[in-house]
């Protein structure tokens, strides 16, 4: 229903706390360089204005759209052009073009320093002094670094953060209480960020239909007892929620997500038997819980998929009558039978089925043509199954760090033109798939591995889009989202690449490496590994292992030496010489 004042409507629905949090996220995601204080001031102004509209919906400007109100606020920021360059040109446009322009200027890789966590004592002091400001800083810092973070989910992580601090700051040993818990939240939030970015990419590049297909597959796997009409309704609502969040309409998105959670909890009987635990929780926890609820038990009496989609005489007629509905029912029926497949795989199978019908239904004898379609799925299913087996075996053999290095070598060979920091970031993220997925039960590995890899590769594509350097990467990133992972997996050594000349300074290290945290040490070593591969793209695994073992030994020796600086300056050049010889 239409409201006289959109801003008053959202304020009333969401409540002041969530309203302010979402407005802060929105501003931080649009203007990523502004300080917390600048944004906090704008948020307060918008909130005060919303309250006047709640009191009187007919008050001046209360009838304006949220885009108009927020855009006007952003455009009134002093020194906009100095700080943001051509983004300021957006302010010369009218809505809805102005908002589209802001969206196009969101930066997936802003030049901001990494978000460093203060030490425990300092964190607890500032948290106790002003919990609201502390959480505001958290929302601001995460949102500006992740401009597509799913806003209602970021509120959930802030709530988690709050609960951890409340609990741990009361403990004697704050550090050992906080560190593992906050690390856990950080890891989950980073995964949530890349997953949501993938959804927004799907929406931006391929439209609502593509996202809805993803949602149908995912929901059908999770709720195999819900009928097609129910799944379609949920998928439509979920598509609307994600479209709003990806489009910067964060208040609408959070409000509609809460509505969807409410609907699901009121209709458990027709959706799933597994929702009750989630539905007993407060709003943010409820919506989060529903988004990752375990799969319901599959109905025992499902007929073979072939009955309706291969053997039925009416296949082409049904397809002709309503292509999207027929393909949707195929995706639904196939997905609910296969919780053990990735959504990407299910979408590839649906695409194959669609292509088969397009070809076969135009023939004189369609049934003879499409009769073998299910058998033709086999190679499409085997490929990701083999990928999971090979990679999980390798992970079990090498551990996370070793597995990351193996991936780093592989991907540097596939796309040596890509910048080393991007390759290292990608390999480290791709390598985490082992820890995340390979320890799961067999039937959960494939969906975990492939859908996670797809999300990480989407980030590789986004970063590469900014500065395209590799034809291999461009080729894989240009295709459909579901074909990306198989495309990257199939890439081999880039034969067109002219190896980098050997620069001694690239492999020269100093004693400051010894005091770095373990993660930073790993990144330094992985940076050197990528540079080695760029120097010798066809180096064998044995050669690279020899060099990296030598390098690790060198670091270990010099970091234990009494005079570290002397050790690094004398042994360093010897290491460089040995590396050159080993790779000759």
């Amino acid at each position: 229903e239409a409201h006289k004042s959109e801003i008053a409507h959202r304020y009333n629905d969401l409540g002041e706390q969530h309203f302010k949090g979402l407005v802060l996220i929105a501003f931080s995601q649009y203007l990523q360089k502004c300080s917390y204080d600048e944004h906090a001031k704008l948020v307060q102004e918008v909130t005060d204005f919303a309250k006047t509209c709640v009191a009187d919906e007919s008050a001046a400007n209360c009838d304006k759209s949220l885009h108009t109100l927020f855009g006007d606020k952003l455009c009134a920021i002093p020194n906009l052009r100095e700080n943001y360059g051509e983004l300021a040109d957006c302010c010369t446009k009218q809505e809805p073009e102005r908002n589209e322009c802001f969206l196009q200027h969101k930066d997936d890789n802003p030049s901001l320093p990494p978000f460093e966590r203060p030490e425990a004592e300092a964190m607890c002091t500032s948290f106790k002094e002003n919990p609201t400001t502390f959480m505001g800083h958290y929302l601001h810092e995460v949102a500006r670094r992740h401009p597509y973070f799913y806003a209602p989910e970021l509120l959930y992580y802030a709530e988690q953060y709050n609960e951890i601090l409340t609990q741990c700051c009361a403990e004697a040993d704050k550090e050992s209480c906080l560190t593992p818990k906050l690390d856990g939240v950080k890891e989950k939030a980073l995964v949530s960020s890349v997953r949501q970015r993938m959804k927004c990419s799907s929406m931006q590049k391929f439209g609502e239909r593509a996202f809805k297909a993803w949602a149908v597959a995912r929901l059908s796997q999770t709720f195999p007892n819900a009928d097609f009409a129910e799944i379609t309704k949920l998928a439509t609502d979920l598509t609307k929620v994600n479209k709003e969040c990806c489009h910067g309409d964060l208040l609408e998105c959070a409000d509609d997500r809460a509505e969807l959670a409410k609907y699901m909890c009121e209709n458990q009987a027709t959706i799933s038997s597994k929702l009750q635990t989630c539905c007993d929780k407060p709003l943010l926890k409820k919506a989060h819980c529903l988004s990752e609820v375990e799969h319901d038990t599959m109905p025992a009496d499902l007929p073979a998929i072939a009955a309706d989609f291969v053997e039925d005489q009416e296949v082409c007629k049904n397809y002709a009558e309503a292509k999207d509905v027929f393909l949707g029912t195929f995706l639904y029926e196939y997905s609910r039978r296969h919780p053990d497949y990735s959504v990407s795989l299910l979408l590839r199978l649906a695409k194959k089925y669609e292509a088969t019908l397009e070809k076969c239904c135009a023939e004189a004898n369609p049934p003879a043509c499409y009769g073998t379609v299910l058998a033709e799925f086999q190679p499409l299913v085997e490929e990701p199954k083999n990928l999971v087996k090979t990679n999980c075996d390798l992970y079990e053999k090498l551990g996370e760090y070793g597995f990351q290095n193996a991936i780093l070598v592989r991907y540097t060979q596939k796309a040596p033109q890509v910048s080393t920091p991007t390759l290292v970031e990608a390999a480290r993220n791709l390598g985490r798939v082992g820890t995340k997925c390979c320890t799961l039960p067999e039937d959960q590995r494939l969906p975990c591995v492939e859908d996670y890899l797809s999300a990480i590769l989407n980030r590789v594509c986004l970063l590469h889009e900014k500065t395209p350097v590799s034809e291999h990467v461009t080729k894989c990133c240009s295709g459909s989202l579901v074909e990306r992972r198989p495309c990257f997996s199939a890439l081999t050594v880039d034969e067109t690449y002219v190896p980098k000349e050997f620069k001694a300074e690239t492999f020269t290290f100093h004693s400051d490496i010894c005091t770095l945290p373990e993660k930073e040490k790993q990144i330094k070593k992985q940076t050197a590994l990528a540079e080695l591969v760029k120097h010798k793209p066809k180096a064998t695994a044995e050669q690279l292992k020899t060099v990296m073992d030598d390098f690790a030994q060198f670091l270990d020796t010099c970091c234990k030496a009494a005079d570290k600086d002397t050790c690094f300056s004398t042994e360093g050049p010897n290491l460089v010489t040995r590396c050159k010889d080993a790779l000759a």
Epitope: Q313, V315, C316, K317, E321, C361, A364, N365, P367, A368
Partner: nanobody, 115 residues
């Protein structure tokens, strides 16, 4: 909404000819193979002939070979069945169908062959 409307049936004497038409709407006609099927009084459905979307490929039941010709005009979204040397056993309601479907989803057109 998919619609198939057959026409051209009627009463003819044995040995004569008829041309049946099927006007199609509600789908991309040229993307689908089409068929003619028939149902004689008191009998089940019997496949007669099929044609590919482009019109380049045709198939006939043994009972139709050499006497019937299936064709289509994609610019008019119309399917045809030219029936020559008609026999009393060709008496039936003729239906056009999408793809290899052996079912009736239209009214059909009655062909009666009798002296």
């Amino acid at each position: 909404k998919v619609q198939l409307v057959e026409s051209g049936g009627g009463l003819v004497q044995p040995g004569n000819s008829l041309r049946l038409s099927c006007a199609a709407s509600g789908f991309t006609f040229s993307s689908f193979g089409m068929s003619w099927v028939r149902q004689a009084p008191g009998k089940g459905l019997e496949w007669v002939s099929s044609i590919s979307g482009s019109g380049g490929d045709t198939l006939y039941a043994d009972s139709a070979k050499g006497r019937f010709t299936i064709s289509r005009d994609n610019s008019k979204n119309t399917l045809y069945l030219q029936m020559n040397s008609l026999r009393p056993e060709d008496t039936a309601v003729y239906y056009c169908t999408i793809g290899g479907s052996l079912s009736r989803s239209s009214q059909g057109t009655l062909v009666t062959v009798s002296s």
